[in-house]
């Protein structure tokens, strides 16, 4: 019995004085406790307690469930304990099959002794099968069996208690361990789409899925910078034991322009927490943007190839796309794709394809497209370069030489006197009149351009070159003079294109 | 001999919280699971969350973003905290211990009405 | 989360008959299953355990089983003081969830 320092009080005694009784099953308990303040006895086993107010606690005829720590308490809240053993060859243990582990944390197999002598008191797995190798158990006949620092791998581990007694092994009733796993790394969150556009009136959803361990894991769907709860519905199943997988599933049944923003689907577990966004737009009617890939205002050379290609945002998506020249729509030569095969895409692309352009076919090229709530149109002018081309080359009744060219960009037109029989024309004339004449073709074609000279300036037969240039070319035409006394006559004109 | 006891409001008004204690006796919180489990007047039983023996907790995926459990083992009790309460969460709240044996002993329960 | 689906909702049956409820599991659930008897204005009470496994005091009369991931109660020769609900309940992972339950009648 436990002694003190008088005027101290004192912890109660009993009787008898050792620390564990062992009793045969059927025969009588009889504690004593001796205290001026006695409060209560306690009997405690597998976590389970009762109470007594008499200070001698008797059991008359011991039963193996009778097994436990009894204890006295005082007014003082001073204590003192016997464990009785009753012991009962036909019940060694007194089980409660209740067993959670936590992994890496240690656990109790709850099945204590009714009986401290018999021997390899142990573990053992169910059906024969061995215990994991790396299972650590420490016995403690009072309480059960530690196992230590519980694995993953034990979950549903199904074993008994076990002792020997005369050279037999028996074995408790089966206990299957029930692991939760430990959160060893941030829960993985992924979400349906990463930005959803959407028109005012229709519904936004969006499905974050969340992973991890155990549906312990925590997560929920916030909008960034905002407090409000949003509304979300759940769906989880268990892929096998330590792989959990939850939908979070976040609507608004007819979104509105202010709820445009940022959502983040957050998860977190005692490990740490992962997050993903996604974007809402909500516009209040669908749009078409154009933007052109090259510049709209087009120069081609006659006979070369040019591809007029725009890019365009549509939503919602495209429905008619035309190319369209002179009020004639296009059946081939373009193409329409989107930009990406991204679900979320609403990026296109569209492609004229002109080849060998002839002078005639510059002009407004114009694209049309069209969804559900908008149309829109760009214009391309295009302008073919032409090698000015000589209509007219004449000696006109009032002795003035004309010259009249066509050609894009805007012909110039020189003249040249050669004398006698030279073939190099270099002397200059200055003509009298230019004129840019307007074309009766459309308004891309070529430019028509008139020049005259004063053939009395020529005095000596000879040669008189008209010639018309631009970027792109140069043509000429020739006037032959030759004096019969003091008239001059125009021999033929002819023209030599020079390349 | 095992215990529990369910105790709180009676009457709690809508979009308040509602506070419950489950007291335990006879066995220890930190070798047992206690669970809260409702029940709406005339309808199925729901499970509500869990206080786990080393003090985790786990909760009902429709609740658990207004529902907290906690537990102080040295008074041996158990506490439920629900808030913004509706109509809808009028019910019988019982608490019960649960073993590998199923739910072994449960409380009597508290009936919580939500009302104004 | 793992649903429970159980059926019959409701049955009336005589004393001779063998009365079957049944609880489908959304997923599997090994073998962690139970079954609760309540009456009206009193707590559930805890019949079945791990599927077969009959809880203290229950009579041999409740029975359970397991095909995949069917669960079945049986009671075979009910007695009056076998009117109440029934339901199962899973506890093979968090969030546990039970079955709508079935209202026996004894006629």
């Known amino acids: 019995q436990p002694s003190v320092s008088p005027g101290e009080p004192s912890p109660p005694s009993i009787h008898p004085g050792k620390s564990d009784l062992i009793v045969r099953v059927g025969d009588e308990i009889r504690l004593l406790c001796t205290d001026p303040g006695f409060v209560k006895w306690t009997f405690e086993i597998l976590d389970e307690t009762n109470e007594n107010k008499q200070n001698e606690w008797i059991t008359e005829k011991a039963e193996a469930t009778n097994t436990g720590k009894y204890t006295c308490t005082n007014k003082h809240g001073l204590s003192n304990s016997i464990y009785v053993f009753v012991r009962d060859p036909a019940k060694l243990f007194l089980v409660d099959r209740s067993l959670y582990g936590k992994e890496d944390n240690d656990t109790l197999v709850r099945c204590p002794l009714t009986d401290p002598e018999v021997t390899n008191y142990s573990l053992k797995g169910c059906q024969g099968k061995p215990l994991p190798k790396d299972l650590r158990f420490i016995p403690d006949p009072k309480a059960g069996i530690m196992i230590k620092s519980v694995k993953r791998a034990y979950h549903r581990l199904c074993l008994h208690c076990s002792v020997d007694q005369e050279g037999k092994s028996v074995l408790s009733e089966k206990f299957i361990l029930k692991v939760r796993p430990a959160f060893k790394a941030v829960p993985v969150v992924s979400v349906s789409k990463a930005s959803y556009l959407l028109r005012e009136g229709e519904e936004f959803t969006v499905t974050c899925t969340i992973k991890d361990v155990s549906s312990s894991v925590y997560s929920t769907w916030k909008r960034e910078n905002s407090q409000t709860k949003l509304q979300e519905k759940y769906n989880s199943w268990h892929h096998g034991d330590f792989n959990y997988e939850r939908q979070a599933t976040l609507t608004i049944s007819s979104a509105r322009v202010n709820d445009s923003g940022v959502f983040m689907c957050y998860a977190n577990n005692t490990f740490g927490s992962a997050n993903v966004t996604t974007t809402l737009e909500v516009v209040d009617k669908g749009f078409i943007n154009i933007f052109p890939m090259i510049n709209t205002t087009v120069f081609v050379n006659d006979g070369e190839n040019v591809d007029l290609i725009v890019e365009y945002e549509a939503f919602p998506k495209p429905e008619h796309q035309q190319w369209i020249y002179m009020n004639r729509t296009f059946t081939d030569k373009w193409e329409d794709y989107p930009k990406s095969e991204n679900e979320s895409n609403i990026r296109y692309v569209s492609e004229l394809h002109l080849t060998r352009l002839k002078g005639t076919e510059g002009g407004t090229y114009t694209f049309l497209v069209s969804n559900s709530d908008v149309n829109a149109a760009i214009a391309f002018n295009v302008y073919v370069n032409t090698k000015p081309e000589i209509l007219t080359y004449d000696r006109l009744v009032n002795g003035m030489l004309q010259c009249v060219a066509a050609g894009f960009p805007e012909p110039t037109i020189d003249w040249y006197f050669c004398p006698g029989t030279e073939q190099r024309c270099s002397a200059s004339v200055l003509p009298v009149d230019v004129q840019t004449l307007n074309s009766s073709g459309p308004p891309f074609g070529k430019l028509v351009v008139q020049s005259s000279i004063d053939s009395s300036a020529f005095k000596h037969n000879g040669t008189v070159e008209c010639k018309a240039y631009n970027d792109v070319g140069k043509t000429s035409a020739y006037f032959n003079f030759a004096f019969k006394g003091n008239n001059k006559e125009q021999i033929h004109p002819h023209t030599l294109f020079t390349p | 001999q095992v215990q529990l006891k369910e105790s709180g409001p009676g009457l709690v008004q809508p979009s308040q919280t509602l506070s419950l204690t489950c007291t335990v006796s006879g066995f220890s919180l930190t070798s047992y699971l206690v669970h809260w489990v409702r029940q709406p007047p005339g309808k199925t039983l729901e499970w509500v969350g869990l206080?786990?023996?080393?003090?985790?907790?786990s909760y009902n995926s429709a609740l658990k973003s207004r529902l907290s459990i906690s537990r102080d083992t040295s008074k041996s009790q158990v506490f439920l905290k629900m808030h913004s309460l509706q109509a809808e969460d009028t019910a019988t709240y019982y608490c019960?211990?649960?073993?590998?044996?199923?739910?072994?002993?449960w409380g009597h329960g508290t009936l919580v009405t939500v009302s104004s | 989360d793992i649903q429970m689906t159980q059926s019959p909702a409701s049955l009336s049956a005589s004393l001779e008959e063998i009365v079957t409820i049944t609880c489908k599991a959304s997923?599997?659930?090994?073998?962690?299953l139970s079954w609760y008897q309540q009456k009206p204005g009193k707590s559930p009470q805890l019949l079945i355990y791990d599927v077969t496994r009959l809880a203290d005091g229950v009579p041999s009369r409740f029975s359970g089983s397991r095909s995949g991931t069917q669960y079945s109660l049986k009671i075979s020769r009910p007695q009056v003081a076998d009117s109440g609900i029934y339901y199962c309940l899973q506890s093979y992972s968090t969030p546990y969830t039970f079955g709508a339950g079935t209202k026996l009648e004894l006629k």
């Open positions: 019960a211990r649960e073993s590998n044996l199923g739910f072994t002993y």
């Open positions: 206080m786990w023996n080393d003090g985790d907790t």
């Open positions: 997923q599997g659930i090994d073998d962690d």
